[in-house]
Amino acid sequence: KETAFVEVVLFESSPSGDYTTYTTGLTGRFSRAGATLSAEGEIVQMHPLGLCNNNDEEDLYEYGWVGVVKLEQPELDPKPCLTVLGKAKRAVQRGATAVIFDVSENPEAIDQLNQGSEDPLKRPVVYVKGADAIKLMNIVNKQKVARARIQHRPPRQPTEYFDM
């Protein structure tokens, strides 16, 4: 289980139309459910129940976004519509270039994601927990445009990313 270095950039627009960027670094782990490779895209939060819908109630996103899913406590969803791996697959089917799970409330999900799948996803499936997860979810819920870059080595220079 390799460390995933996640850099999240929050874009805030000023009244003048300029953008200010705020960069936050956090770490997670690549799970065996997906590939250990880099990915980058706009963050889209996905509700674990929303992933149950087969009939795409909302627009399908263009390919290349990073899905963020905060998993529930298992007792709140005793009969989940999909396994955690199934939710990752559903997100990738809908165009996610990577999926990040916040497993803080459901640490059992780590084992589920690491049960060596015969057919792992070709995109990275990362999990975060604790302080890193709190940081991520606070950014995701700020209602600003945010992008995530996932790497399997520490970022070198913060200036080299997100050339807009």
Epitope: V44, Q45, M46, H47, P48, L49, G50, L51, N53, D56, E57, E58, D59, G67, V68, K70, E72, Q73, L76, R94, M137, N138, V140, N141, K142, Q143
Partner: antibody, heavy 123, light 109 residues
Framework: QSLEESGGGLVQPEGSLTLTCTAS?????????MCWVRQAPGKGLEWVAC????????TYYANWAKGRFTISKTSSTTVTLRMTSLTAADTASYFC????????????????WGPGTLVTVSS | DIVMTQTPASVEAAVGGTVTINCQAS??????LAWYQQKPGQPPKLLIY???NLESGVPSRFKGSGSGTQFTLTISDLECADAATYYC???????????FGGGTEVVVK
């Protein structure tokens, strides 16, 4: 950015009414929800219905509103609420509100509200 | 559907004082809770989202906290302009719907 409701007024019991919400300076193509929330005189807020402004146009209703109320996006700047089989219990101020897009499968909180339009159901 | 229970229904406090409003969800909604202020004859105004994030332009005297099923709105250094009715709202899932609490009237003496 602003929202304005119209179409309220006095209606007979079992009658019908269509409310319209007109948006100014709002891009309906951006992911968001347009919703109706009502408030009976001297009472609290009650969610009625929402429509997703993206191309899917998915609609969501409070359980009590299903079958009687219909929310629609009628143009790039207007949303309507068609209300049928009205009773005195439907007497309220009806607010149009814009819901922030939180993510796929989430509901929304309301960042922008219209001033409201009063609907009175009485004979 | 989620049911939001707000307490107390009414609270009175002096200028400069502090009031605490509680909101309880019938099931866990994580941190997906908003708080609104409504004055007579006006539409509601968003104060806080994601349980504790202050909406732009809202004074830091307003503080939201909590997660899961228990949430609190605390207003400190009360001003006369804070006299209003406050509502909590869950926005957990489009499947479970949108739900408001019953409201809490804040009277400032």
């Amino acid at each position: 950015q602003s929202l304005e409701e119209s179409g309220g007024g006095l209606v007979q019991p079992e009658g019908s009414l269509t409310l319209t919400c007109t948006a100014s300076g709002i891009d309906f193509s951006a992911r968001s929800y347009m919703c109706w929330v009502r408030q009976a005189p001297g009472k609290g807020l009650e969610w009625v219905a929402c429509i997703y402004t993206g191309s899917s146009g998915s609609t969501y209703y409070a359980n009590w509103a299903k079958g009687r109320f219909t929310i629609s996006k009628t143009s790039s700047t207007t949303v309507t609420l068609r209300m049928t089989s009205l009773t005195a219990a439907d007497t309220a101020s009806y607010f149009c509100a814009r819901g922030a897009y939180v993510g796929y499968g989430f509901a929304a909180y309301f960042t922008l509200w219209g001033p409201g339009t009063l609907v009175t159901v009485s004979s | 559907d989620i049911v939001m229970t707000q307490t107390p229904a009414s609270v009175e406090a002096a200028v400069g004082g502090t009031v605490t409003i509680n909101c309880q969800a019938s099931q866990s909604i994580s941190s997906y809770l908003a708080w609104y202020q409504q004055k007579p004859g006006q539409p509601p105004k968003l104060l806080i989202y994601y349980a504790s994030n202050l909406e732009s332009g809202v004074p830091s005297r307003f503080k939201g906290s909590g997660s899961g099923t228990q949430f609190t709105l605390t207003i400190s250094d009360l001003e006369c302009a804070d006299a209003a009715t406050y509502y909590c709202q869950a926005y957990y899932s489009s499947i479970t719907g949108w739900a408001f609490g019953g409201g809490t009237e804040v009277v400032v003496k």
